[in-house]
Interface confidence: low
């Protein structure tokens, strides 16, 4: 009976071990050990038994020792096991950005690393454990399927491997690949809200408002607004899970006619997009001509009103016949037509909107100067000692400069209120004077004395 | 509007363990993770650890690793934070704050529990 | 861990002037998707911090825009155009891009 000490051993790769063959017999006629092992006989043994080395061990070998006693040849063998840690534990690239709600596939591989029973490979958040596989085929590939919410932004992910030699060498080693952090997002599949006008006028400012809710991590959101070949530059406020741009826009004449109006919200991989049509149109202000913007009173004038040619007017409140760009009346110049207003407004369609433009020009009428009995009575009766206020008012334009004298010296304080003299008493010139020449009324002043009884 | 309600103020002797709270309202409470932050006169504002509100998983400040113990009580909207085997080193104002997982700023603090410990 | 830096630790300031508190980082801030999570908080006396600017220069809604941020990689300003009383207290940067996350050590931003 031959016998082996000892009969299992778990050594590391390229590890040395000592195996002691002993035989049954005290004298055998032979004793030794087959192996393909570099092995190395440890003297002195003993007449029964011998002590080997084996070197360099690198992979799993049955050396046998074999011993022959009188009563017979016999054999046994020892299990070497053994062990060595992976080579290469690496976690596949994560997506660079994975949508919340949709599944993730954790992808590991693993090269080498023995003995294979005793390996196991785990797929980790952080220090949590998703999944625990054994490792089969070479490399050894373990995938698993994760659920990613919103939370999962920034975690890390990773994938571990165990190699569990308890109780033989009370060791549990472990190899850890480098972590792998994801970036997780949630675009909602509505699209942008485009608030703006649908109708603009070139050479002004118009604004535009592009605004998302339920966007996840809203601060990696970024928005393209875009109208036509221009490039807008908006304005971002960000809230709880959404954003807004706001953005001013003036269009030229040569953007003039339709244009597309873009908005654009990039987050992760994906793009939600708005699009909406802006027509640029170009509508000066009509136009209002006075033949003479100054005339005087009795001269005839034309009033003309010119819009664009697409444009239909009123002039003064009053439509052109038949509705169009042009419209025109003549007056003959009165005072009180001096100050008046002439309002010409013009009204365009542009893509079903109504736009309105107005223009005003005042007239000028040149008149006077005058001096009536309405304005400048031609006799007063004032009792002596009574508080009176002269009131006479001469009319023109321009406007004349007046003056009543008694005895061309003696001045009658006109709107002003004064205590009744007999000084005051007599005739008086009154003289108005304009540019345009001059008028005289006579203003008599009779002063009452009271009676005495 | 987003709020974060804390636990009121703890006096502990050494030894003994505390639990504090912070209850969420205002938003949907798993869409977020909970952040503790420690806030003492040596060492200003230290981050403990975050704990999402929707798996319940965790990652520590290595320092704070087997002194705090984070949770989280889906139903309630209210996260938890025990501290263990106090010392007077634990008397702070302890904040929860509101946050992504771990690249996220904090957008919105507790007002802040403030812990004495003291025999 | 990553240290952050601030200075200065006190900054005496006379409303409506400028202020300016820098924020050093011990490693660079620029996460691998090229965004630097770095963030400033404001806590005043007897409350909690507040978010005022997150990922660097990006205003946190209802922060008045006299509050401006810059910077990349490991050096950090936040500025404030025209300091109001309101504006007085501690302020903090924080980093996120590493774990674990690491405050400043704070500046004081009191009256002159």
């Known amino acids: 009976q031959t016998s082996v000490f000892p009969p299992e051993v778990i050594l590391p790769r390229g590890g040395s071990v000592k195996v002691n063959c002993s035989a049954s017999c005290d004298q055998p006629i032979s004793l030794g050990m087959e192996t393909p092992l570099p092995k190395k006989e440890i003297l002195p043994g003993g007449n029964n038994w011998k002590m080997y080395e084996l070197s360099n061990v690198q992979e799993d070998s049955q050396p046998m020792c074999y011993s022959n006693c009188p009563d017979g040849q016999s054999s046994a063998k020892t299990l070497l096991t053994v062990y060595w840690t992976p080579e290469r534990v690496e976690l596949a690239p994560l997506p660079p950005w994975q949508p919340v709600g949709k599944n993730l596939t954790l992808r590991c591989q693993v090269e080498g690393g023995a003995p294979r029973a005793n390996l196991t490979v785990m797929l980790l958040r952080g220090e949590k454990e998703l999944s625990r596989q054994s490792a089969v085929g070479e490399p050894a590939e373990v995938t698993t399927t994760v659920p990613v919410g919103r939370d999962d932004h920034g975690a890390n992910f990773s994938c571990r491997t165990e190699l569990d030699l308890r109780p033989y060498v009370l060791k549990l080693f472990e190899n850890t690949s480098a972590p792998h952090q994801l970036q997780t997002f949630d675009l909602p599949a509505t699209p942008p809200q485009l608030v703006s006008p649908q109708v603009l006028e070139v050479d002004t400012q118009g604004t535009v408002v592009c605004s998302l809710d339920g966007l996840f991590p809203v601060s990696e959101a970024q928005v393209s607004l875009a109208l036509g070949d221009q490039k807008l530059n908006p304005t971002i406020t960000y809230g709880n899970n959404s954003l807004s741009a706001k953005a001013s826009v003036k269009v030229t004449a040569e953007e003039e006619g339709t244009q597309q109006l873009l908005c654009g919200v990039m987050l992760g991989n994906q793009t939600q997009e708005t699009r909406q049509t802006v027509t640029i149109y170009s509508f000066p202000a009509p136009n209002v001509n006075l033949t003479k913007p100054e005339v005087s009173e009795g001269t005839e004038v034309i009033v003309e009103c010119e819009a664009h040619p697409r444009a239909k007017v009123m002039l003064n409140g009053v439509p052109a016949q038949p509705p169009g760009p042009r419209a025109q009346f003549l007056l003959k110049a009165t005072p009180e037509d001096n100050g008046r207003s002439f309002s010409c407004s013009a009204t365009l369609e542009v893509a079903g909107q109504l736009v309105h433009k107005n223009q005003t020009r005042e007239l000028r009428v040149l008149y006077g100067p005058r001096l009536d009995e309405k304005d400048c009575p031609g006799n007063w009766t004032w009792p002596e000692n009574s508080q009176q206020t002269p009131m006479c008012q001469a009319w023109g334009n321009p406007l004349p400069q007046l003056k009543c004298l008694k005895d061309g010296t003696f001045p009658l304080p006109i709107g002003q209120s004064v205590t009744v003299t007999r000084d005051l008493e007599g005739t008086y010139l009154c003289q108005a004077r304009s540019t345009r020449g001059e008028v005289t009324r006579e203003v008599t002043v009779n002063v009452l004395s009271p009676r005495y009884e | 509007q987003v709020q974060l309600q804390q636990s009121g103020p703890e006096l502990v002797r050494p030894g003994v363990s505390v639990k504090i709270s912070c209850k969420g309202s205002?938003?949907?409470?798993?869409?977020?993770?909970i952040h503790w932050v420690k806030e003492s006169h040596a060492k200003s504002l230290e981050w403990i650890g975050v704990?999402?509100?929707?798996?319940?998983?965790?990652n520590y400040n290595q320092k704070f690793k087997g002194k705090a113990t984070m949770t989280v009580d889906k139903s309630s909207n209210t996260a938890y934070l025990e501290l263990a085997r106090l010392t007077s080193e634990d008397s702070a104002i302890y904040y929860c704050?509101?946050?992504?997982?771990?690249?996220?700023?904090?957008?919105?603090w507790g007002q802040g529990t403030t812990l004495t410990v003291s025999s | 861990d990553v240290v952050m830096t601030q200075s200065p630790l006190s900054l005496p300031v006379s409303l409506g002037d400028q202020a300016s508190i820098s924020c050093r980082s011990s490693?660079?801030?620029?996460?691998?998707?090229?965004?630097?999570?770095l963030h400033w908080y404001l806590q005043k006396s007897g409350q909690a911090p507040k978010l005022l600017i997150y990922?660097?220069?990006n205003r946190f809604s209802g922060v008045p825009d006299r509050f401006s941020g810059s910077g990349s990689g490991t050096d950090f300003t936040l500025k404030i155009s025209r300091v109001e009383a309101e504006d007085l207290g501690v302020y903090f940067c924080?980093?996120?891009?590493?774990?674990?996350?690491?405050f400043g050590g704070g500046t004081k931003l009191e009256i002159k």
């Open positions: 490693q660079s801030l620029v996460h691998s998707n090229g965004n630097n999570y």
């Open positions: 704050a509101r946050g992504g997982w771990l690249l996220l700023s904090f957008d919105y």
């Open positions: 704990i999402s509100a929707y798996s319940g998983d965790t």
């Open positions: 990922k660097v220069s």
């Open positions: 924080s980093q996120s891009t590493h774990v674990p996350l690491t």
């Open positions: 205002g938003y949907t409470f798993i869409d977020y993770a």
